[in-house]
């Protein structure tokens, strides 16, 4: 089987001339393409992967909402040679994007990372935007998180920052098959420079204090009962509240090495996507087709939006 292969971050990598073809390894009988688009009130971007896949042919479209950050996920798998270029990976212009002057700022101010690389979205480097209320929703919180897409033995991840409706969310996420949008929210001007280590404590909610059991018991029993602690708590704290509904997605540090495109362990190049870089061109039948005429992401109204944290 021969498939198209590319990895897109923001708007490079699946661009027209960068499309590759790869011969899939033995036993691989589907080509795959997956795209995840994230829409903030200040713009949108997408991540995408094309390559040799696994599983069965078919399509999966989903719309997700995380505190006013909208995510659209599409997966398409097919079993013919070079069939994995049917999804439109080009984004249409957002209504508010580029026209923010028409909206009244509500006083909140956040760092904005929309399609920026991890290097450009560190600390206070990214641009600052004024939040505004849109579509009857109040955007007064700031968000710091990641979008991650895994397909064709490749994982691509980009940071996401911007204005959201929630001001206190902690490590919240929404997921689709191989797709995760996760992060934390905060309140205050430019508070979303780095929320990786945000714990579940909130000024409005007193922390849950777990009292140590009486010391008459053997001390070794305490060490084994670690279910009440998680790695999400501050290093010196042994208490945290676990939110079972949230997606426990990794919230990659901007200070870590750039692992935005990761070839999964054990994956051979022939079995996955090759290439590097982000927005994709469209494929399809011969003939000049406008990108705007290609299949669109599911609209906000018609998209299936599961409960927060659901899949």
């Amino acid at each position: 089987l021969e498939c198209y292969s590319c990895v897109q971050k923001a708007d490079d990598g699946c661009s027209p001339h960068r499309m590759k073809t790869v011969k899939c390894g033995p036993g691989v009988d589907v080509c795959t393409e997956a795209v995840g688009a994230v829409e903030t009130i200040h713009g949108q971007f997408s991540v995408a992967v094309r390559g040799c896949g696994s599983g069965i042919p078919g399509k999966n479209d989903r719309g997700l909402d995380l505190h006013g950050l909208l995510a659209f996920f599409q997966l398409q798998q097919c079993s013919e040679d070079r069939c994995n270029a049917k999804l439109n990976l080009t984004l249409r212009g957002l209504n508010p994007a580029g026209n923010e002057s028409a909206y009244e700022p509500n006083g909140a101010e956040c760092y904005s990372c929309v399609g920026l690389s991890r290097e450009k979205c560190q600390g206070s480097m990214p641009p600052v935007v004024n939040c505004y209320n849109a579509s009857g929703r109040v955007y007064k919180g700031c968000f710091d998180g990641n979008v991650t897409l895994t397909a064709a033995n490749v994982t691509v991840s980009l940071p996401v920052r911007g204005c959201v409706q929630d001001e206190t969310c902690t490590r919240d996420g929404v997921t689709g098959p191989g797709f995760t949008l996760s992060g934390s929210c905060c309140q205050g001007p430019r508070c979303n420079a780095d929320l990786r280590n945000k714990t579940y404590f909130s000024p409005r909610i007193p922390p849950l204090v777990l009292l140590p059991p009486p010391t008459t018991a053997a001390p070794s029993t305490r060490a084994q009962n670690s279910s009440s602690t998680t790695s999400t708590a501050a290093p010196t704290t042994t208490t945290s509240i676990i939110k079972p509904t949230t997606a426990q997605a990794s919230h990659t540090s901007p200070h870590e090495m750039d692992l935005e495109v990761i070839q999964e362990e054990g994956a051979s190049l022939s079995g996955g996507a090759a290439g590097h870089g982000g927005t994709a061109g469209h494929g399809g039948a011969a003939g000049h087709q406008d990108r705007s005429n290609m299949e669109k992401y599911p609209g906000k109204g018609g998209a299936q939006i599961p409960a927060k944290g659901g899949s």
């Epitope: 292969s5 960068r18 590759k20 080009t90 984004l91 494929g283 406008d290 990108r291």
Partner: antibody, heavy 117, light 112 residues
């Protein structure tokens, strides 16, 4: 109908500057990657520069790096090429081209840039 | 010197089949990047003839076909006509140069 119309070419002295424009119509410009490609008289095609749909990703050929700047104004459906420190070897017909279907699927008619003293 | 190598000229008589080769390297065609072909009629802008190795845009006759193998590609024109007299260029992305590269072009002459 897709149309690309270049303008801004002309005669310039070595070391001088020119700004080329390419007005696009008949397609959603803000969704398209665009490039400049040039052709010296009697010679072959040479890719010059590439810009992504949003303008955030840009590539240049080594021969023009540091001297030429590609940009776009999606609100005006226009692609630009600012050419500084021009040399005699930059003399060519400059085409703007749309990237679609994984290739340059539409080209303008070209604008001639002549660098001579 | 062009990154992709094409013969400078090719010729044939009407009705004949002509093939133009395009040889690249491991950083372009050999890296798996798809190959495109352009036709440039005298005094006009180039026109896309074949994209994605072997696909024809609408309006391009099926006399034109493309193929790719390893680090090279070829364009075949069957049933040659006088209006096919033009320059033909191949193109592909190049990882080393981080941009699309063209062949030097092949001038096709239709004899007789």
């Amino acid at each position: 109908e897709v149309q690309l119309l270049e303008s801004g070419g002309g005669l310039v002295q070595p070391g001088g500057s020119l700004r080329l424009s390419c007005a696009a119509s008949g397609f959603t410009f803000s969704n398209a990657w665009m490039s400049w490609v040039r052709q010296a008289p009697g010679k072959g095609l040479e890719w010059v520069s590439y810009i992504s749909s949003s303008g955030s990703t840009i590539y240049y050929a080594d021969s023009v790096k540091g001297r030429f700047t590609i940009s776009r104004d999606n609100s005006k459906n226009t692609l630009y090429l600012q050419m500084n420190s021009l040399r005699a070897e930059d003399t060519a017909v400059y085409y703007c081209a749309r990237e679609g279907l994984w290739a340059f699927d539409y080209w303008g008619q070209g604008t001639l840039v002549t660098v001579t003293s | 010197q062009s990154v992709l190598t094409q013969p400078p000229s090719a010729s044939g008589t009407p009705g004949q089949r002509v093939t133009i080769s395009c040889t690249g390297s491991s950083s372009n065609i050999g890296a798996g990047y798809v190959v495109h072909w352009y036709q440039q009629l005298p005094g006009t802008a180039p026109k896309l003839l074949i994209y994605d190795n072997n696909k024809r845009p609408s309006g391009v006759p099926d006399r034109f076909s493309g193929s790719k193998s390893g680090t090279s590609a070829s364009l075949a024109i069957s049933g040659l006509r006088s209006e096919d007299e033009a320059d033909y260029y191949c193109a592909a992305w190049d990882d080393r140069l981080n941009g699309p590269v063209f062949g030097g072009g092949t001038k096709l002459t239709v004899l007789g």
